[in-house]
């Protein structure tokens, strides 16, 4: 058993049929010694008396808010949550496996640049009695500070018969060094509580591996005289790290016909312009990627050929 | 060339070679063999390799003030990785394919380190750590980890040389 926060405790249980459970001793936070009784949740049934209460925690029915009283007055509370371990593996019932980039991916994170700011998100089908708390650091043995905001509900989607809820959080490394080569990964820890179930999820990454630039901006076409060719130009996204002579991007320019089946023409360039042939009803798209490190491509920025 | 005394390197040549190194490091990575040994290792091999850190002067301001600190750190790293790529980790079982980009990568690391430091000048280099793989699967794991860490190192070096070529070239 360990303390999650003041008066909230997590009991770790091996979860299998007829498991013996864990013996837990609760102590009433009071100078009083006599006449103390204990109840669980809203029930008025007295579970025991005395300054301490010993219980055998085996299932969710044994978890909840234990209260000690004296003469009708509440002295203190202890909320017990359960953390299930099945066959040596902690349960992951609350969050949905996003399966990208690999199985058992519950948290996904992205950064728009090297400033040390990043966003993480996760999915669940649970709509009520759900709380999240997020902590982060750079490294784990001698952790350096990363400050995270509160997790917020950022999207709701209908998936078949189910509703899916997306939560996200923004974090910022306290003393980021954008030009350095990271040697210690960022660790993100999410505590999830649904009713009386506690779970924790972690992700470990380097900012360089979660970089996804915003799409290029100001995408423009300039027809070339007496030619089907056009000059496409664009600019670095505002959110990208500066100076651009140091934090350089590379670009992919694509000409795509109306039909998805039509052959795509692609050009790769380090410049912020390219010359391509504009076909009727086609569109021109440009996306960006770090020039020297193959993290994610940005989403496409597009303009119609016409 | 970056002479320890302080003359400028051939920024443009260094830029071209470091960008080639980036391409090679990424093309070598998936080709060292099939790999799903999860890299969730609690101990990182990369703790043992030289990193371009915050105080090494490799940021744009640091390069403007005095690029020598940064160039020395890059040189140290290039020599270190060149030695690793020539070690038993990459030459032992399982054998790399004859046309593996690791050979080109090895040669290019040496080429860039020589551009930075002509013969007769010596910057301090770091000892390569004893990672002591005894099994082929351990070598394979180390190859992946070393190449991942090399990708990060050469990305920073390439940024340095690109910025130097754009802003510090005579």
């Amino acid at each position: 058993i360990w303390e999650l926060k003041k008066d909230v405790y997590v009991v770790e249980l091996d979860w299998y049929p007829d498991a013996p459970g864990e013996m837990v001793v609760l102590t009433c936070d009071t100078p009083e010694e006599d006449g103390i009784t204990w109840t669980l949740d809203q029930s008025s049934e007295v579970l025991g008396s005395g300054k301490t209460l010993t219980i055998q925690v085996k299932e969710f029915g044994d978890a909840g808010q234990y209260t000690c009283h004296k003469g009708g007055e509440v002295l203190s509370h202890s909320l017990l949550l359960l953390h299930k371990k099945e066959d040596g593996i902690w349960s992951t019932d609350i969050l949905k496996d996003q399966k990208e980039p690999k199985n058992k991916t519950f948290l996904r994170c992205e950064a728009k640049n090297y400033s040390g700011r990043f966003t993480c998100w996760w999915l669940t089908t649970i709509s009520t009695d759900l709380t999240f708390s997020v902590k982060s650091s750079r490294g784990s043995s001698d952790p350096q500070g990363v400050t995270c905001g509160a997790a917020t509900l950022s999207a709701e989607r209908v998936r078949g018969d189910n509703k899916e809820y997306e939560y996200s959080v923004e974090c910022q490394e306290d003393s980021a060094c954008p030009a350095a080569e990271e040697s210690l990964p960022i660790e993100v820890m999410v505590d999830a509580v649904h009713k009386l179930k506690y779970e924790n999820y972690t992700s470990s990454f380097f900012i360089r591996d979660i970089i996804k630039p915003d799409p290029p901006k100001n995408l423009q076409l300039k027809p070339l005289k007496n030619s089907r060719q056009v000059e496409v130009s664009w600019e670095y996204p505002d959110t990208w790290s500066t100076p651009h002579s140091y934090f350089s991007l590379t670009f992919c320019v694509q000409v795509q016909g109306k039909s998805k089946r039509e052959k795509k023409d692609r050009v790769f360039t380090d410049k912020t312009s390219a010359t391509v042939i504009c076909r009727k009803n086609a569109s021109i798209s440009v996306r960006a990627q770090d020039r020297y490190y193959s993290s994610s491509w940005s989403e496409w920025a597009s303009v119609p050929c016409s | 060339r970056a002479v320890p005394g302080g003359s400028s390197p051939a920024w443009t040549q260094c830029q071209q070679l470091s960008q080639k190194l980036c391409t090679l490091a990424w093309s070598a990575h998936p080709l060292v063999g099939h790999m799903d040994l999860r890299e969730e290792g609690d101990e990182e091999t990369t703790n043992d390799v030289p990193h371009i850190q915050c105080g090494d002067g490799c940021d744009p301001q640091g390069l403007r003030d005095n690029s020598q600190f940064c160039l020395q750190r890059i040189h140290q790293g290039l020599i270190f990785y060149e030695k690793l790529l020539g070690s038993d980790i990459f030459t032992g079982e399982p054998s790399l394919l004859p046309d593996s980009p690791v050979g080109q990568l090895h040669a290019s690391l040496l080429g860039l380190s020589q551009l930075l430091q002509p013969e007769g000048h010596h910057w301090e280099t770091q000892q390569i750590p004893s990672l002591s793989p005894s099994q082929p699967w351990q070598r394979l794991l180390l190859r992946f980890k070393i190449l991942r860490s090399l990708q990060a190192f050469v990305a920073v070096a390439a940024r340095v040389f690109a910025h130097g070529a754009a802003t510090l070239s005579p």
Epitope: - | E39, E93, L142
Partner: antibody, heavy 121, light 111 residues
Framework: EVTLKESGPVLVKPTETLTLTCTVS????????ISWIRQPPGKALEWLGV???????NYNSGIKSRLTISKDTSKSQVVLTMTNMDPVDTATYYC???????????????WGQGTTVTVSS | DIVMTQSPDSLAVSLGERATINCRAS??????????MHWFQQKPGQPPKLLIY???NLESGVPDRFSGSGSRTDFTLTISSLQAEDVAVYYC?????????FGGGTKVEIK
């Protein structure tokens, strides 16, 4: 289908040399390592040695001086030679494929049926 | 050599009940966070069969009532609900250092 089949003498006299052949199919010896493992009657398993994809070998130091493992990749055959046999070498000898280096980390994913060798005069 | 010690030597469990086998290595069998610990099942007259590789990965075709956990020196094989066909001897094996070594085996029977 991946198969490994051991063949060789059933009975060997003390001091003689044992030669066992492992013939494999369904994969190439240039892609997978092969180990030899033995199991005395009613006892646990003992690893004898391995021949790697590139032809290098490693042996159990306890019996290294008596062992040789070689292979002919084109014939899909691996040969175990063990000199100076003794009654304590009586065991079932298995030829075993080591799983893909990058996934299995030394786990042996396919085993032959084994051949029982008795050492007796 | 790395010595692998299995416990218990034998285990009698009722059908549908849980069986747990432990394996302790005399030194760590982890290499940069990868556990080179594997579990095999051997039925009478048959060669061993790989069940779990790298401590916790289920070999394809093996029922998911089998699971493995642990790291460094302490490992566990669990059969969550014993079936009649699970009666066998179970071995752990390390491949972190030469020579590869096996545990002495745990015989699982039905109570």
């Amino acid at each position: 289908e991946v198969t490994l089949k051991e063949s060789g003498p059933v009975l060997v006299k003390p001091t003689e040399t044992l030669t066992l052949t492992c013939t494999v199919s369904g994969f190439s010896l240039s892609s997978y390592a092969i180990s030899w493992i033995r199991q005395p009657p009613g006892k646990a398993l003992e690893w004898l040695g391995v021949i790697w994809t590139g032809g290098g070998t490693n042996y159990n130091s306890g019996i290294k001086s008596r062992l040789t493992i070689s292979k002919d990749t084109s014939k899909s055959q691996v040969v175990l030679t063990m000199t100076n046999m003794d009654p304590v070498d009586t065991a079932t000898y298995y030829c075993v494929r080591e799983g893909d280096y990058g996934s299995y980390a030394g786990a042996m994913d396919y085993w032959g049926q084994g051949t029982t060798v008795t050492v007796s005069s | 050599d790395i010595v692998m010690t299995q416990s218990p030597d034998s285990l009698a469990v009722s059908l549908g009940e849980r069986a747990t086998i432990n394996c302790r290595a005399s030194e760590s069998v982890d290499y940069y966070g990868i556990s080179s610990m594997h579990w095999f099942q051997q039925k009478p007259g048959q060669p061993p069969k790989l069940l779990i590789y790298r401590a916790s990965n289920l070999e394809s075709g093996v029922p998911d009532r089998f699971s493995g956990s642990g790291s460094r020196t302490d490992f566990t094989l669990t059969i969550s609900s014993l079936q009649a066909e699970d009666v066998a001897v179970y071995y752990c094996q390390q491949a972190n250092k030469d020579p590869y070594t096996f545990g002495g085996g745990t015989k699982v029977e039905i109570k």
